[in-house]
């Protein structure tokens, strides 16, 4: 069954998928599609990489990690309820029927807006409140607590750092990961 990931409306959703290249720069084509992985390829392709680069993507779908090191995790920007569904990450390993397929279930819930305090001290009111950190069983969420006063540019930077530092290891542990070679 699919591993479940969650986000709230208006957030960026993150669907982890990883592989380990046989050698640095020795990349494998990857496709992401909406819908469960079919026998071949991806249905309703939203993003695709080849041996060198991202060669196809659609609005709001991008790879935020270092795909040259095998981090092909998908970010979906500014999600709505209609982004809920099964997503397929397919690592297209050369050879007959060698592909690795991962079905990831994304569930979007309505955003919960908390009344803003007089002075904006709560990071979570200015940026998505919950970030999924584990994929097994019921989606565990990590709520980000109070931080010092920061402006919007800092929020964006801080969000990236938080995701990269605090979540990447957790997600790598719990997400779709394979080693090649």
């Amino acid at each position: 069954s699919e591993v479940e990931y969650r986000a709230e409306v208006g957030q960026n959703a993150y669907l982890p998928c990883f592989y380990t290249p046989a050698a640095p720069g020795n990349l494998v084509p990857v496709c992401w599609g909406k819908g469960a992985c079919p026998v071949f390829e991806c249905g309703n392709v939203v993003l695709r990489t080849d041996e060198r680069d991202v060669n196809y993507w659609t609005s709001r779908y991008w790879l935020n990690g270092d795909f040259r090191k095998g981090d092909v995790s998908l970010t979906i920007e500014n999600v709505t309820l209609a982004d809920s569904g099964i997503y397929c990450c397919r690592i297209q390993i050369p050879g007959i029927m060698n592909d690795e397929k991962f079905n990831l279930k994304l569930v979007i819930k309505p955003a919960k807006v908390t009344p803003a305090p007089t002075r904006q001290r709560d990071f979570t009111a200015a940026f998505p409140r919950m970030l999924t950190t584990r994929g097994h069983g019921p989606a565990e969420t990590q709520t980000l607590g109070s931080l010092p006063d920061i402006n919007l540019t800092q929020i964006s930077t801080l969000a990236n750092e938080l995701r990269d530092s605090r979540l990447a290891n957790d997600l790598r542990d719990s997400g779709a990961t394979i080693r090649i070679g």
Partner: antibody, heavy 119, light 107 residues
Amino acid sequence: QGQLQQPGAEVVKPGAAVKLSCKASGYTFTSYWMQWIKQRPGQGLEWIGEIDPSDNYTDYNQHFKGKATLTVDTSSSTAYLQLSSLTSEDSAVYYCAREGAFSSPFAYWGPGTLVTVSS
Amino acid sequence: DILMTQSPSSMSVSLGDTVSIICHASQDIRSNIGWLQQKPGKSFKGLIYHGTNLEDGVPSRFSGSGSGADYSLTISSLESEDFADYYCVQYVQFPRTFGGGTKLEIK
């Protein structure tokens, strides 16, 4: 998929309040948001609001703020819609509906409760 | 509020026909649309969600399509149980808003 049960009808006097119930069974009550909808003949459908039974978080249609209050009782897997200061304009069928597995907000509906405001 | 304009308001059709009902939103709703069926004197049943997906147990003769602000529900090879009222609903924005409904009648 589960079931939603609602009483068939309620008759209430103008100015009074009424609390409508929607009893859920056959699914995990706290996992799915509940919607409430009003239907008046010739007036179409109006969305009243929604509630997350896991933490009682609510979103309301501004038109129903002060008129409608959404609550849940997780111990009995029941959602409630309370309507206050009733007038003839509140005479309608009120439905609860719950979301489906992929965040479809109006997947499964209760049978509705006909509220008649009459002296 | 997002206005959902549904057309036609009623149509007379025959068994076996294929019909389409249209909903136009007053802005882009990014496939955040559902289609509902209400039989006379009964409650509602969800048919389609997120523009194109069938709810559980809904026959494959029902289908949804569209993008942006324009969406449609198509029923192919109409059966007697399909004569009912149909509504669209958007849920991209609060408040959720419904179309005015389409009554499907037997010719």
